[in-house]
C-alpha cells in the first residue's frame, strides 16, 4: 500500500512540477524592470524567454517576439534549451509513469516491468527538474551580473545636464515558478525511484519444507546461502503475503511542499 501511495504521490507531484516548468517557460516575466531608481515611471518593462513586453499605466501592453535566433545571447539560448529539454523529458517521464502506476492494469504487465518503468520515469523527472532548476539559475545569474553592471554606470549624460536612466532588470515571477516547479519535479522523481524499490519483485519466499532422507533428518531451506551471505533477498523482517514480500518497516516519509510567497 505504501509503495502505491508513494508512486501515486510521486506521479502527482511530478505532474504539478512539469506543469509549472511549462508555465514558467511560457511566462513573459522572467525579468522585470527594477523600479527602485525610477518608481514614478508610467511605463513598465518585462521580458521572457520568447518575447519582451511593455505595459503602460493605462494597462496598454505591447509585446514583441525575439524574431532573431542568431542575434540572441548564447546564455538565453542555453536557458531555452534547458527548459525545453526539461519539458520533453518530463513529458516522456509522465507518459512512462502512467503505464507504470500500480493502480493501473495494462494487460498482463509484470511487476518487474512496472518497476523498471517507474525507475525510468523517476530518473527522467529528476533530470527534468535539474534542467529546469539549472535553466532558471543560469538566467538568474545573468540578471544579477547585468544588474550590477548597469548599476555601475547608472547615469550617463552630457555635462551632467541630461540624465539617461538605464533600465535595470530584476527577478521576475517566472524564476520563482521555475525554481519551485523544478524542485517539485525533482522530489516527484525521487519518490518514483523510492517506489521502484518496493515494486521490484523479490525472490519467491517458500515456507520451509522438510525432506526426510534415509538415515538422518535435514531441514532444507531454499535460498539459505543467499540469505546468510547477504546477497539476493534478505528475508529478515519480512511478512509473507500471497502477493509477494513487503518489508514491515517500509514507511515512506514525504517531503513537505513549500510554496513560494
Amino acid at each position: 500500500m505504501a509503495v502505491t501511495a508513494c508512486q501515486g504521490l510521486g506521479f502527482v507531484v511530478s505532474l504539478i512540477g512539469i506543469a509549472g516548468i511549462i508555465a514558467a517557460t511560457c511566462m513573459d516575466q522572467w525579468s522585470t524592470q527594477d523600479l527602485y531608481n525610477n518608481p514614478v515611471t508610467a511605463v513598465f518593462n518585462y521580458q521572457g524567454l520568447w518575447r519582451s513586453c511593455v505595459r503602460e499605466s493605462s494597462g496598454f501592453t505591447e509585446c514583441r517576439g525575439y524574431f532573431t535566433l542568431l542575434g540572441l545571447p548564447a546564455m538565453l539560448q542555453a536557458v531555452r534549451a534547458l527548459m525545453i529539454v526539461g519539458i520533453v523529458l518530463g513529458a516522456i517521464g509522465l507518459l512512462v509513469s502512467i503505464f507504470a502506476l500500480k493502480c493501473i492494469r495494462i494487460g498482463s504487465m509484470e511487476d518487474s516491468a512496472k518497476a523498471n518503468m517507474t525507475l525510468t520515469s523517476g530518473i527522467m523527472f529528476i533530470v527534468s527538474g535539474l534542467c529546469a532548476i539549472a535553466g532558471v539559475s543560469v538566467f538568474a545569474n545573468m540578471l544579477v551580473t547585468n544588474f550590477w553592471m548597469s548599476t555601475a554606470n547608472m547615469y550617463t549624460g552630457m555635462g551632467g545636464m541630461v540624465q539617461t536612466v538605464q533600465t535595470r532588470y530584476t527577478f521576475g515571477a517566472a524564476l520563482f515558478v521555475g525554481w519551485v516547479a523544478g524542485g517539485l519535479t525533482l522530489i516527484g522523481g525521487v519518490m518514483m525511484c523510492i517506489a521502484c524499490r518496493g515494486l521490484a519483485p523479490e525472490e519467491t519466499n517458500y515456507k520451509a519444507v522438510s525432506y526426510h532422507a534415509s538415515g538422518h533428518s535435514v531441514a532444507y531451506k531454499p535460498g539459505g546461502f543467499k540469505a546468510s551471505t547477504g546477497f539476493g533477498s534478505n528475508t529478515k523482517n519480512k511478512k509473507i503475503y500471497d502477493g509477494g514480500a513487503r518489508t514491515e518497516d517500509e514507511v515512506q516519509s514525504y517531503p513537505s511542499k513549500h510554496d513560494y510567497v
Partner: antibody, heavy 118, light 113 residues
Framework: QVQLKESGPGLVAPSQSLSITCTVS????????VHWVRQPPGKGLEWLGV???????NYNSALMSRLSISKDNSKSQVFLKMNSLQTYDTAMYYC????????????WGQGTSVTVSS | DIVMTQSPSSLTVTAGEKVTMNCRSI????????????LSWYQQKPGQPPKLLIY???TRESGVPDRFTGSGSGTDFTLTIRSVLDEDLAVYYC?????????FGSGTKLEMK
Amino acid sequence: QVQLKESGPGLVAPSQSLSITCTVSGFSLISYGVHWVRQPPGKGLEWLGVIWAGGRTNYNSALMSRLSISKDNSKSQVFLKMNSLQTYDTAMYYCARDRYGGNSLDYWGQGTSVTVSS
Amino acid sequence: DIVMTQSPSSLTVTAGEKVTMNCRSIQSLLNSGNQKNYLSWYQQKPGQPPKLLIYWASTRESGVPDRFTGSGSGTDFTLTIRSVLDEDLAVYYCQNSYSYPFTFGSGTKLEMK
C-alpha cells in the same frame, strides 16, 4: 461619440476646497483612465493627476497633499477635490481621457473656469 | 520632475511656410523596452481645449493632417508643420508621458505675419 463635461462651482473663497465633476459619455471608465489638467489665465498647461481604469491614482507631486481624484464607474463620473485653495489656483480645469497607448490625452472636455477670490 | 523646455516661445510665419519647433527634456523619454519615446504634442487654439496631434514622439493621431510631423529621440524632439495654414495658428505644447508627473512644456505660440 466620446464626450467629457466638467462642472464646477466657478467661484471659490481662499482656503476653501474645490470639487469638480467630470461626466463622461461614449466610453466606459472601466476601460479608460481620466486625467485632470489645469491652465491659469494666459499661462501654460499643468498636469494635476490621473485616475486609471482600475482605480489607481497618480498625482502631481507638488499638489499631492491637497489633491484627491476619485470616480463612480456606474455614473460615469470622475471627481477632483482640491483643498486649501489660494488665488494662484485660479485656472481653467480640464478633464481628458487617456488614449490607451502612449499615455496621451486624446479627448478633452471644454473645461470649467475656477476663480479663487474673496 | 522632468522639466520640458520649448523653443522658440513664439514664431511668426507666413502661410505656406515650413515651421519647426523644438522640445527638450532633462531626462531621456526613450523606453528601452519598446524603443518608443514617450512624448506627445498638443495644439491649443484660443478659447478651446488642447487637441492631441502626436504621441510616441512621431505617431500621428487619427484625423490629424499629414503636414504635422513629429521627430526626435531621447531628449530632443521636433514638431514640423510642412506647409502652415491659417488654421494652424495656435499654441503648441509638448508633454512628457514617460514619468510622473506628466509635465508640459511652456508652449510655442504660432502667429501669422
